[in-house]
């Protein structure tokens, strides 16, 4: 789980191990703050929990452009 | 492809406690998400508890909250599902699920199964 | 946590009729944004583990006859046996994965009129 030591700066310590499928994800952001020890992904699911991820993991890159054509296509 | 192995049958007497194993081969355990799921003789099934990825950690059915503590070993690629304070009403057949390597929530791979017969 | 109701408790048709189970969720399990329905449906034979048949409430798992066929929205689900055949007669049941506590359904005994 994401780490808010010195809000509003949230950090990322661990990875989740787990590939979680793209239809359980709500959306997510980046971290890339230098007061962070790492570079991470947190996503956000459809019931609102959050979850640190890799960002050089393939399946978080594809996860991310999923979710970012999501956003972009206008629902029917 | 997974594959899931459980151990063999056992007879407990009231007040013990069981240890059911789920042995996984094609993937490794901390790659997936191990759950338990129980069935009474001819009742339904009954979600017990299991790991889930957004939690991050393991969480149980709240009717066997204190009861039941469920453990992986990943050098050994088991995971493990262990009872205590065993009642007559726990006899049923213990599985062990996991849903594929992406997480969704619904259970792909089942392991055959192992009875649990509770009697004094 | 979410309850899931089947009906009937049990059925009996008759070979090459259509078979109809019902699933009602206590609280929606659809997810607007991506219009996916976290439900799924499973068969059970005697002395078996359940078989996944269909996820996402109407995608058939690959392998499974197009004779079995879900649909639904929402907090109402149907599986469809399209012609009974005898290797059909099981006990299904329907699970939402929308939140924690997973659950199922109570099952629904399929057999042969």
């Known amino acids: 789980q994401p780490d808010a030591i010195n809000a509003p700066v949230t950090c990322c310590y661990n990875f989740t191990n787990r590939k979680i499928s793209v239809q359980r994800l709500a959306s997510y952001r980046r971290i890339t703050s230098s007061k962070c020890p790492k570079e991470a992904v947190i996503f956000k699911t459809i019931v609102a929990k959050e979850i640190c991820a890799d960002p050089k993991q393939k399946w978080v890159q594809d996860s991310m452009d999923h979710l970012d054509k999501q956003t972009q296509t206008p629902k029917t | 492809q997974v594959q899931l192995v459980q151990s063999g049958a056992e007879v407990k007497k009231p007040g013990a406690s069981v240890k059911v194993s789920c042995k996984v081969s094609?993937?490794?355990?901390?790659?997936?998400?191990m759950h338990w799921v129980r069935q009474a003789p001819g009742k339904g099934l009954e979600w017990m508890g299991g790991?889930?990825?957004?939690?991050?950690?393991?969480i149980y059915a709240q009717k066997f909250q204190g009861r039941v503590t469920m453990t992986e070993d990943t050098s050994t690629d088991t995971a493990y599902m262990e009872l205590s304070s065993l009642r007559s009403e726990d006899t049923a057949v213990y599985y062990c699920?996991?849903?594929?390597?992406?997480?969704?929530?619904?259970?792909?791979?089942w392991g055959q199964g192992t009875l649990v017969t509770v009697s004094s | 946590d979410i309850v899931m109701t089947q009906s009937p408790d049990s059925l009996a048709v008759s070979l090459g009729e259509r078979a109809t189970i019902n699933c009602k969720s206590s609280?929606?399990?659809?997810?607007?944004?991506?219009?996916?329905?976290?439900l799924a449906w499973y068969q059970q034979k005697p002395g078996q583990p359940p078989k996944l048949l269909i996820y996402w409430a109407s995608t058939r798992e690959s392998g499974v006859p197009d004779r079995f066929s879900g649909s639904g929205s929402g907090t109402d689900f149907t599986l469809t046996i399209s012609s009974l055949q005898a290797e059909d007669v099981a006990v299904y049941y329907c699970q939402q994965y929308y939140n924690s506590p997973w659950t199922f359904g109570q099952g629904t005994k399929v057999e042969i009129k």
């Open positions: 609280q929606s399990v659809l997810y607007s944004s991506n219009n996916e329905n976290f």
């Open positions: 699920a996991t849903d594929r390597e992406f997480w969704s929530g619904y259970f792909y791979h």
């Open positions: 094609g993937y490794t355990l901390t790659e997936l998400s």
């Open positions: 790991f889930d990825p957004e939690d991050g950690e393991t």
